[in-house]
């Protein structure tokens, strides 16, 4: 019974203790995107820096080919910010055949891919109409939430238009996840 | 070997267990900023409430002179929201010499200062063009992400224009960090 | 002294270790809101999905009647995103008796209710003027921060106009909290 005093009664065998320092974690930062083919109705995935500057992966959380690979099951906090920038979207010319234009928009989706499941799952979406008057425009979309993930799940960030993503600074566009 | 049964094999000596309740944490809330001179091309830092209302610092995380001081090395989640407000930005008068105006903008930067390093590091940036037509405007910029910090690092929040920051409510503009 | 080696000196009796896997956690997702009466100057609360799709509650964190019920005292990270959508707000017709209209706005508030305290506490607010020209519009407001909560506290999400909330997808509008 000697060791017992360091294991309070509410911590039973079913939930082993684990050091925070060895939990899977990653913070990825933007890089300039290489031109790629993508299907018309499918949002392209961003690829990321995973080791230079502010970026890192640790404790078996690996980045490969646009995906963060989840190394163990558990609850993860997942977040991303994408900064978009563009020239004026002329949605102020609003009347065409007597009705408003469909607005331009910018969208970020954090997507989970599970190999055993045919369809990707959209975990988080930030979507915004863009109807700027008279200027170049720029703005971020931020997302973050907690999800229960399984070992082997893969995470990616998709955007509505890769050409509008601001890739100039690692603090403007990023993607991360950590086991809680 | 008696104590061994409460230390599962994946927790080696290199990563000691530690209680969550004693981790460094802070949530700071907005206060009215005092009149100060600041250089034209340098974003001013906000100062914060650290003990009244919703604000707190705990477990050796200290706030002093606009900085959060990091008391131990590790991975921290850092976040801030700044709500901006202003009168109409006249960017609707768009054509000058046949080209659009440079837009007005609002920017928040979370910055890390390391005494041994000459230049501050920008960890997070949220920047948005502001081109509002015909009214007072107000809007938040939210940022949050995980970073590996070292004991002694200092964190601050800088903004593009301190006079546009909404200081009226502690739930509108805030800054926080916690060790994971 | 045998068990001592697994309890480093900075972990005293006052802060018992606890397994991460048994901490209270919840991620709630949007559902279509049922029409309800609410007072003119009071923002209505959203109700949520708590078990289908991406939504879950665990480890004694319960959802009931628009509230997340906090089962144990501690520091929690709380977050929400609400996506709003609407038809054009005609604030571009700016001159009425020579002055601009008061702007339309969208607001999200995360509120804490403590039974022993008469007034709810606003923990987080995201508020944005909406002055869109020439189109339907849509946009998210994201909030997240850390707060010290007490057992029995209740959390809810209030919005300025329930009819503008996009309830169509679980990844667009959500609410969550987890014990740190």
């Amino acid at each position: 019974l000697k060791g017992q005093e360091f294991a309070p009664s509410h911590q039973q065998v079913y939930a082993p203790l684990r050091a925070d320092g060895d939990k899977p974690r990653a913070h990825l930062t933007v890089v300039r995107q290489t031109p790629t083919q993508h299907f018309k109705n499918q949002f392209p995935a961003l690829h990321w820096e995973h080791e230079l500057g502010l970026a890192f992966t640790k404790n078996r959380m690996n980045y490969t080919n646009k995906f963060l690979l989840i190394p163990e099951s558990g609850d993860y906090f997942i977040y991303s910010q994408v900064t978009f920038r563009g020239m004026t979207s002329e949605c102020s010319e609003i009347r065409q055949a007597g009705r408003p234009n469909k607005p331009d928009s910018i969208t970020v989706v954090i997507t989970k891919v599970t190999d055993s499941y045919p369809e990707p799952t959209q975990l988080l979406m930030g979507t915004k109409s863009v109807c700027e008057v008279g200027s170049n425009w720029f703005q971020p979309i931020y997302l973050g939430a907690m999800f229960s993930l399984q070992e082997g799940d893969k995470l990616m960030v998709n955007v509505s238009d890769i050409s509008l993503v601001d890739y100039t600074k690692e603090d403007k566009t990023f993607f991360g996840a950590f086991l809680l | 070997l008696k104590g061994q049964e409460f230390a599962p094999s994946h927790q080696q000596v290199y990563a000691p267990l530690r209680a969550d309740g004693d981790k460094p944490r802070a949530h700071l809330t907005v206060v009215r900023q005092t009149p100060t001179q600041h250089f034209k091309n340098q974003f001013p830092a906000l100062h914060w409430e650290h003990e009244l209302g919703l604000a707190f610092t705990k477990n050796r995380m200290n706030y002093t002179n606009k900085f959060l001081l990091i008391p131990e090395s590790g991975d921290y989640f850092i976040y801030s929201q700044v709500t901006f407000r202003g009168m109409t930005s006249e960017c609707s008068e768009i054509r000058q010499a046949g080209r659009p105006n440079k837009p007005d903008s609002i920017t928040v930067v979370i910055t890390k200062v390391t005494d041994s390093y000459p230049e501050p590091t920008q960890l997070l940036m949220g920047t948005k063009s502001v081109c509002e037509v015909g009214s007072n405007w107000f809007q938040p910029i939210y940022l949050g992400a995980m970073f590996s910090l070292q004991e002694g690092d200092k964190l601050m929040v800088n903004v593009s224009d301190i006079s546009l920051v909404d200081y009226t409510k502690e739930d509108k503009t805030f800054f926080g960090a916690f060790l994971l | 002294l045998k068990g001592q080696e697994f309890a480093p000196s900075h972990q005293q009796v006052y802060a018992p270790l606890r397994a991460d896997g048994d901490k209270p956690r919840a991620h709630l997702t949007v559902v279509r809101q049922t029409p309800t009466q609410h007072f003119k100057n009071q923002f209505p609360a959203l109700h949520w999905e708590h078990e289908l799709g991406l939504a879950f509650t665990k480890n004694r964190m319960n959802y009931t009647n628009k509230f997340l019920l906090i089962p144990e005292s501690g520091d929690y990270f709380i977050y929400s995103q609400v996506t709003f959508r609407g038809m054009t707000s005609e604030c571009s017709e700016i001159r009425q008796a020579g002055r601009p209209n008061k702007p339309d706005s969208i607001t999200v508030v995360i509120t804490k209710v403590t039974d022993s305290y008469p007034e709810p506490t606003q923990l987080l607010m995201g508020t944005k003027s909406v002055c869109e020209v020439g189109s339907n519009w849509f946009q998210p407001i994201y909030l997240g921060a850390m707060f010290s909560l007490q057992e029995g506290d209740k959390l809810m999400v209030n919005v300025s106009d329930i009819s503008l909330v996009d309830y169509t997808k679980e990844d667009k509008t959500f609410f969550g909290a987890f014990l740190l």
Epitope: - | V31, R32, Q33, P35, E49, L52, M87, N136, S163 | -
Partner: antibody, heavy 119, light 111 residues
Framework: QVQLVQSGAEVKKPGASVKVSCKAS????????INWVRQAPGQGLEWMGW????????GYAQKFQGRVTMTADRSTSTAYMELSSLRSEDTAVYYC????????????WGQGTLVTVSS | QSVLTQPPSVSGAPGQRVTISCTSS?????????VHWYQQLPGTAPKLLIE???NRPSGVPDRFSGSKSGTSASLTITGLLPEDEGDYYC??????????FGGGTKLTVLG
């Protein structure tokens, strides 16, 4: 109704200090910042600084830094402005004013306190 | 140091309309909360007339209106009355978070 009632006129010698009070009523004292504005005889208005009665935080005009101190007594809903090292050019009517949080306009004003600095 | 400039004096006959301008030396004046206008009648404390360029507090007659153009704000009084005679001040906040007042404009109602 909202009222700000200030203390009476003062005559001070150069080098002395003066402390002017402003008693608030008709609203929650801690919910609104109080500003102090002065007006020399025949001159315009000059802003001195603001006080948050809840936290005690203050912001002073650069011209008055080091000479002015603004405080609040929440138990009596009273704001104070103390100006030290007085000189003849500090002769003025001193006003307290309650600020509108959203626009930072000065919505309600005290009646003013004349401070005369003369040897 | 930013400055708000007002004309020293304006005048008008009863029933007429007068406009008082307030010009900023800096583009950031009023960016946050706008320009406010105060009326100070002889021997009294100032009174808020217009806040945020345009908005009249309750109790202020609609003869008083505010407007903005570029780096200038204006106060217009229509249907002048003898009791409008007094000093009028514009006020704003600069980029260093200091409040600024214009130098004041003395309004004389003729006749």
């Amino acid at each position: 109704q909202v009222q700000l009632v200030q203390s009476g006129a003062e005559v001070k010698k150069p080098g002395a200090s003066v402390k002017v009070s402003c008693k608030a009523s008709g609203y929650t004292f801690t919910s609104y910042d109080i500003n102090w504005v002065r007006q020399a005889p025949g001159q315009g208005l000059e802003w001195m600084g603001w006080l948050n009665p809840n936290s005690g935080n203050t912001g002073y005009a650069q011209k008055f830094q080091g000479r002015v101190t603004m405080t609040a007594d929440r138990s009596t809903s009273t704001a104070y402005m103390e100006l030290s090292s007085l000189r003849s050019e500090d002769t003025a009517v001193y006003y307290c004013a309650r600020e509108v949080p959203e626009t930072a306009a000065f919505e309600y004003w005290g009646q003013g306190t004349l401070v005369t600095v003369s040897s | 140091q930013s400055v708000l400039t007002q004309p020293p004096s304006v005048s008008g006959a009863p029933g007429q309309r007068v406009t008082i301008s307030c010009t900023s030396s800096s583009s950031d004046i009023g960016a946050g909360q706008g320009v406010h206008w105060y009326q100070q009648l002889p021997g009294t404390a100032p009174k808020l007339l217009i806040e945020g360029y345009y908005n009249r507090p309750s109790g202020v007659p609609d003869r008083f209106s505010g407007s903005k153009s570029g780096t200038s704000a204006s106060l217009t009084i229509t249907g002048l009355l003898p009791e409008d005679e007094g000093d009028y001040y514009c006020q704003s906040w600069d980029g260093t978070l200091s409040a600024l007042f214009g130098g004041g404009t003395k309004l004389t109602v003729l006749g």
